[in-house]
């Protein structure tokens, strides 16, 4: 799936147009520590701060940075080749809003890969930014071992063999 | 195959920390979750180890039990038991692929007594 | 967390008839829901998983539907084996971890007469 340059969700005055609330985007971790339901007001929040980034054709603008979605297949690190030799990085995860945000996006149902694999040497799950994952956030089913690597399909996210061939999402 | 241990009589406020032996299968591959029944009663899920090693917990059950694992175990502590812990303590293995959790293999459980 | 609502909490009926069981939960869990057999002073047995896939084994008598928040076990021609408590459980998680909570409905007896 390619997507045109901008946002697929239009925001007109802070709220969503033509945009249904996905139904499982959770809870929000608002500054104080006390939580909200996510909304599409949410969705299209800080989107005044967006205008200044400018995303290459084809793709895709949320909240100060840009996306491109692949309709190819590709093994893990192929994947990650293939968003390095572009200047970005397969997707981190940032926060709910930002995976609500993907969920969207995403049109099709079956795995693409995000920039998280399984390093033997920390034994944990590592963003491509070398940075642990939030196991108090995101939870990862299946295998946790060397060659796994973590693909989402819908609201899972799920640990797949590396040299396994899925879609992917760039990001910078 | 699966093997509670360590349920005993306990008085109240004493830790007491249950033991999941596994065999056949790596907790690295499998998650596994732990459940309780009390007398009489319905079962009563209490928490889950992942393949990584992170454990989540019902909400009743936070700060109430934590769970541990070694490369065979998955160990279940009670930190302040009260007579509500009174109950036969299970734990069970995930066998599902990632479309599902498929608790299909469970030990026979270990009674705790408190 | 979501609950789950597990109806009737007993139901007799005579051999070769059929009962139906039936599971609420509080929020939509998909098609994550398992099916549970259980015995006096044996563990559950898993009978269904995924709403409606039958565990290897599990005789065909034994049948799962539905999804979102409404589940119904049924168990056709039954037999004296059948007498038992049988039991829901909502194996529905998602990336974000405070939905990976596993309970279980408040159980069914069925006695079969």
């Known amino acids: 799936l390619l997507v045109s340059q901008g946002v697929l969700l239009k925001c007109q005055k802070g709220s969503c147009s033509n945009a249904t609330q996905y139904e499982d985007t959770g809870d929000l971790k608002v500054n104080n520590g006390t939580r909200r339901n996510i909304s599409n007001k949410d969705l299209c929040a800080s989107r005044s701060a967006d205008q200044t980034v400018l995303c290459q054709s084809e793709w895709l603008k949320y909240q100060g940075k840009c996306y491109w979605f692949s309709n190819e297949m590709k093994s893990w690190s192929d994947s990650y080749v293939y968003c390095l030799e572009r200047k970005s990085h397969l997707l981190i995860i940032h926060d709910q809003l930002e995976m609500a945000f993907i969920q969207k996006n995403l049109r099709q149902l079956n795995y693409v890969w995000i920039g998280l694999n399984f390093t033997s040497l920390k034994m944990t799950w590592t963003w491509v930014d070398g940075s642990p994952i939030d196991s108090k956030i995101f939870f990862i089913k299946g295998p946790a071992k060397e060659n796994s690597c973590a693909a989402i399909k819908e609201s899972k996210i799920f640990s797949e063999t590396c040299s396994s061939v899925f879609k992917w999402i760039c990001q910078y | 195959s699966l093997e509670e241990s360590g349920g005993r009589l306990v008085t109240p406020g004493t830790p007491l920390t249950l033991t999941c032996t596994v065999s056949?299968?790596?907790?690295?591959?499998?998650?596994m979750i732990w459940v309780r029944q009390a007398p009489g009663e319905g079962l009563e899920y209490i928490g889950i180890?992942?393949?990584?090693?992170s454990a989540y917990f019902a909400s009743w059950a936070k700060g109430r039990f934590t769970i541990s694992r070694t490369s065979t175990t998955v160990d279940l502590k009670i930190t302040s038991p009260t007579t509500e812990d009174t109950a036969t303590y299970f734990c069970?293995?995930?066998?599902?692929?990632?479309?599902?959790?498929?608790?299909?293999?469970w030990g026979q459980g270990t009674l705790v007594t408190v | 967390d979501v609950v789950m609502t597990q109806t009737p909490s007993s139901a007799s009926e005579p051999v070769g008839g059929t009962v139906t069981i039936k599971c609420q939960a509080s929020e939509s869990i998909s098609s994550d829901l398992a099916w549970y057999q259980q015995k006096p002073g044996q563990p559950p047995k898993l009978l269904i998983y995924?709403?409606?896939t039958l565990e290897s084994g599990v005789s065909s008598r034994f049948k799962g539907s539905g999804s979102g928040t409404e589940f119904t076990l049924t168990i056709s021609d039954l037999e004296c084996a059948d007498a038992a408590t049988y039991y829901c459980q909502s194996t529905y998680y998602s990336w974000y971890s405070s939905k990976c909570v596993f309970p279980f409905g408040g159980g069914t007896e069925v006695v079969v007469k």
């Open positions: 056949g299968f790596s907790l690295s591959n499998n998650g």
């Open positions: 995924g709403a409606s």
């Open positions: 180890m992942n393949t990584d090693g």
């Open positions: 069970a293995r995930d066998a599902g692929s990632n479309d599902h959790f498929v608790f299909s293999l």
